[in-house]
């Protein structure tokens, strides 16, 4: 059965009111599925299936956040499972469309400060940890949507109201217009339009690629900052290793971001992290006398 | 049904420190948030903080920031609160409460307490 | 902080009387407030969530009003077993906080 978060209201499953047409269905292959005699078909896809208890931990992680952000406490979470439910249930897995999520996107509705906006590219968790610490700035998963769906994954199949358990389309061995692509290309891009002032990005140095043009920072992200609006983009380049010293800020992909950026009439800085646990550690205690020098 | 099991009374020397435990059965343990209150002997209830076990993250009330570490581990569905530099002002029983969903932002459900004493 | 101030700090109540306590909060916490039981030696016991609702299997003597900043818990039909601590908490803002508790003892 359900958990106790569910008493009151158990989850229903319904068809999609209406389905689209579908021009492109994948390279999945088709599996048997069932029993009988006859065949029930399962597209078969190359990348991992949906989530356990997707449907549970969607709920309860909504729950969770309008318990610790009382800001969103207007917030109906059955209403927004509802929406996300309604998103990608009873739709091929490729052709999914911003569009699908403008319901969802409408309830999870936040206003975050402008000008406290963290991206990141490659290095989630240290990011994360930065904004657990320094509780006035805002990654994508601090706001309520990317709470929701953070390191989950979710499909459906089209015409059938069943969530596949079992595979789901691989952004490049499938399709790009999968239910988990859409709806971060979608929220990253209402996020990087939402910035102002100075923009931080969080960048990982270990990376061949410190900047990646094909990452959602890189694709979706940087061709979404508002030249209006946002004043400098400034990269936080994290270094690994204990003896690097070399600045990273002269990287040929650094220098390549620095191009997109002011030719969109943003300016540029770079800054090295060259020591990310003291970084982090000066950011908790900024009186420390170590955290004067140079981090 | 829903049970938070708190450890046993505990005895701290004035700068030491105690760890309290809150053992979560009856629903998963990532998908609730754990709260801690505290409550001096014969004095009301203050609330010290939260903790969301999934990802670790924690929100403590000014006044226990210096004082309390909120953790949680979710392969034993277990919470825990690290109380450092014990003083007699830190004697009191401590619970674990969490909420639920569809009734508010109340706790209607608490660990049976487990009591600091500070003495040396 | 919100300052949760409940009043009176104790009442000296007979079985099957009517008891009335208040809780005023230093700002506006909508309906935001919860209020609690708890009898020497027990975990603190939800009766009333988000001012006016009363929580699972809590008897219907016991209710809740109010919004704002000024709300009121009161008993009907006092039992012997009502005996106990009653408090209030605002669950509107971080940190929550608690009203300092009414004592109820009989005559």
């Known amino acids: 059965g359900l958990n106790d978060i569910f008493e009151a209201q158990k989850i229903e499953w319904h068809e999609g009111s209406h389905h689209h047409h579908h021009h492109h269905h994948g390279s999945g292959s088709l599996v048997p599925r069932g029993s009988g005699s006859v065949p029930r078909w399962r597209q078969q896809w190359s990348g991992p299936g949906t989530t356990k208890r997707f449907p549970e931990t969607v709920l309860a992680r909504c729950v969770k956040y309008t318990e610790i952000h009382p800001e969103m406490r207007h917030v109906d979470c059955q209403s927004v499972w509802d929406a996300f439910k309604g998103a990608f249930i009873s739709k091929h897995p490729c052709n999914i469309t911003e569009e699908d999520y403008q319901p969802l996107m409408k309830l999870g509705t936040q206003t975050v400060p402008c000008n406290k906006i963290l991206l990141w590219s490659r290095i989630k968790d240290l990011a994360h940890q930065f904004t657990q610490v320094q509780r006035d700035m805002f990654t994508l998963e601090d706001t309520l949507l990317g709470y929701l769906a953070d390191d989950l994954t979710w499909c459906g199949e089209f015409n059938t109201s069943k969530i596949n358990y079992q595979s789901c389309p691989d952004w490049r061995k499938d399709c790009s217009n999968n239910p988990v692509s859409v709806f971060w290309k979608t929220v990253s891009r209402r996020f990087a339009e939402a910035a102002c002032d100075v923009v931080h990005v969080m960048l990982n140095g270990s990376r061949s690629k410190i900047f990646d043009k094909n990452s959602t920072f890189g694709s979706v992200e940087v061709h979404n900052l508002q030249p209006e609006k946002v004043q400098t983009l400034e990269a936080w380049v994290i270094h690994g290793g204990r003896e690097d010293s070399r600045d990273l800020c002269q990287d040929p992909t650094i220098k390549e971001l620095e191009s997109i950026i002011s030719k969109r009439n943003i300016q540029f800085s770079c800054k090295n992290i060259y020591r990310p646990d003291k970084f982090l550690q000066c950011v908790k205690n900024p009186e420390d006398s170590s955290c004067t020098s140079e981090i | 049904e829903v049970q938070l099991q708190q450890s046993g009374p505990e005895v701290g020397r004035p700068g030491s420190s105690v760890k309290i435990s809150c053992k979560a059965s009856?629903?998963?343990?990532?998908?609730?948030?754990m709260n801690w209150v505290k409550q001096s002997p014969g004095q009301g209830l203050e609330w010290i903080g939260w903790i969301d076990p999934e990802y670790g993250r924690t929100d403590v009330a000014e006044k226990f920031k210096k004082k309390a570490t909120l953790t949680a581990d979710s392969s034993s569905s277990t919470a825990y609160i690290y109380l450092s530099g014990l003083t007699s002002e830190d004697t009191a029983t401590y619970f674990c409460?969490?909420?639920?969903?569809?009734?508010?932002?109340?706790?209607?459900?608490w660990g049976q307490g487990s009591l600091v004493t500070v003495s040396s | 902080d919100i300052v949760m101030t409940q009043s009176p700090t104790s009442i000296s109540i007979s079985v099957g009387e009517r008891v009335t306590m208040n809780c005023k909060a230093s700002q506006n916490v909508d309906s935001d407030v919860d209020w609690y039981q708890q009898k020497t030696g027990q975990s603190p016991k939800l009766l009333i969530y988000?001012?006016?609702n009363r929580y699972t299997g809590v008897p219907d003597r016991f209710t809740g009003s109010g919004s704002g900043t000024d709300f009121t818990f009161t008993i009907s039909n006092m039992q012997a077993e009502d005996l106990a601590v009653y408090y209030c908490?605002?669950?509107?803002?971080?940190?929550?906080?608690f009203g300092g508790g009414t004592k109820l003892e009989l005559k």
């Open positions: 409460a969490r909420t639920k969903y569809n009734s508010g932002y109340g706790f209607p459900y």
């Open positions: 908490m605002q669950s509107n803002t971080h940190p929550r906080t």
């Open positions: 988000k001012a006016s």
């Open positions: 009856g629903y998963t343990f990532t998908d609730s948030v």
